[in-house]
């Protein structure tokens, strides 16, 4: 399955709108910041295209997830919200219909099941993380960077498979 | 690729200010923060402050906060760094520095330096 | 402010050798599980280039040969084997708080 030129404008804009949310400086925030431990071995170039795409699905589905709670629309501009949930919906279509194409249809190997799991994990911890920080500004401030640079890891995942094609 | 390109070499005299600049191109200037570092001859980096281009928002070290200003202009891609009330301490090579990883306040790429000489 | 202490000021490492540099902050510039410190390497008449993060992470396209370890107040950079283009100042750096500050620098020699 070749995943459409537009998915990668579309991670790049989603990147964009997560830059532009920004409502108050880290700067202030920096007792606040927080190791996720984000899973960056699930995302290493050692998976198949097949093993991969249920993995990113995963990790831009929990991000629609934490995005849409009742906290986070009142953490963020509405407007900016919107139009980032509008680019997240187009990139799960797309790895949906990649699935739907035959990829990753088989049987799931363990080591896909594995790496789900870690990143479902790892978005627990920030959930807890929230929750422990009351959704202060600076908590919300702490986990946009986080995601920031989680999904641009996994943005870099996606080009390195369109390139090997 | 990532770029940062600033002016030339500055010569003034004391109390007087300058204006150094630091063209970005091949990234998204307006979401990096962009930092800016003092190096005296033959000495250390000194940290001057920070600004971010896609509003303006700037954090400076105490020391520098009379002493230098920091803007951005977007639409040129362009950050800039005010120095006033020049003295013969602010003789240095400065340099703007690309914020790297987010939140982890690492410098990646950094320009050329702009040389200020203050002399009378 | 956090001062970050560097030793030595100079040592000349032979060919091949190991070159150990060490950071000390006056204060710990650790939290959550990241240590904010970073190392950078500044050759003459040349700007300074990233080679550390976070004390222990290698930047991309930095040579193997150098790794970053401490956690805390205490901080080392290791480059081994050391080769001839290694010859250059290294700065510690550290982000914990702010205002962000340097160390004063090590100079590498090659003998």
């Known amino acids: 399955c070749d995943l459409p030129q537009t998915h990668s404008l579309g991670s790049r804009r989603t990147l964009m709108l997560l830059a532009q949310m920004r409502r108050i400086s880290l700067f202030s925030c920096l007792k606040d910041r927080h190791d996720f431990g984000f899973p960056q071995e699930e995302f290493g170039n050692q998976f198949q295209k097949a093993e991969t795409i249920p993995v990113l699905h995963e990790m831009i589905q929990q991000i629609f997830n934490l995005f849409s709670t009742k906290d986070s629309s009142a953490a963020w501009d509405e407007t900016l919200l919107d139009k980032f949930y509008t680019e997240l919906y187009q990139q799960l279509n797309d790895l949906e219909a990649c699935v739907i194409q035959g990829v990753g249809v088989t049987e799931t190997p363990l080591m896909k099941e594995d790496s789900i799991l870690a990143v479902r994990k790892y978005f627990q911890r920030i959930t807890l993380y929230l929750k422990e920080k009351k959704y202060s500004p600076c908590a919300w401030e702490v986990v946009r960077a986080e995601i920031m640079r989680s999904f641009s890891l996994s943005t870099n995942l996606q080009e390195s498979l369109r390139s090997k094609e | 690729q990532v770029q940062l390109q600033e002016s030339g070499t500055v010569l003034a005299r004391p109390g007087a200010s300058v204006k150094m600049s630091c063209k970005a191109s091949?990234?998204?200037?307006?979401?990096?923060?962009m930092h800016w570092v003092k190096q005296r001859p033959g000495q250390g980096l000194e940290w001057i402050g920070v600004?971010?281009?896609?509003?303006?928002?700037?954090t400076y070290n105490q020391k520098f906060k009379d002493k230098a200003k920091l803007t951005a202009v977007t639409s040129a891609n362009t950050a800039y760094m005010e120095l006033s009330s020049l003295t013969n301490e602010d003789s240095a090579v400065y340099f703007c520095?690309?914020?790297?990883?987010?939140?982890?306040?690492?410098?990646?790429?950094w320009g050329q330096g702009t040389t200020v000489t203050v002399s009378s | 402010d956090i001062v970050l202490t560097q030793s030595p000021a100079s040592l000349a490492v032979s060919l091949g050798q190991r070159a150990t540099i060490s950071c000390r902050a006056s204060?710990?510039?650790?939290?959550?599980?990241?240590?904010?410190m970073h190392w950078y390497q500044q050759k003459p008449g040349q700007t300074p280039k990233l080679l550390i993060y976070?004390?222990?992470n290698l930047e991309s396209g930095v040579p193997a040969r150098f790794s970053g370890s401490g956690s805390g107040t205490d901080f080392t950079l290791n480059i081994h084997p050391v080769e001839e283009e290694d010859a250059a100042t290294y700065y510690c750096?550290?982000?914990?708080?702010?205002?962000?500050?340097f160390g004063s620098g090590t100079k590498l020699e090659i003998k």
């Open positions: 520095t690309r914020n790297y990883k987010y939140d982890y306040y690492t410098m990646d790429y």
């Open positions: 091949g990234y998204s200037f307006t979401t990096y923060w």
């Open positions: 600004i971010y281009p896609g509003n303006g928002d700037t």
């Open positions: 204060k710990s510039v650790s939290t959550s599980g990241h240590s904010y």
């Open positions: 976070l004390a222990s």
């Open positions: 750096q550290h982000s914990g708080e702010l205002p962000f500050t």
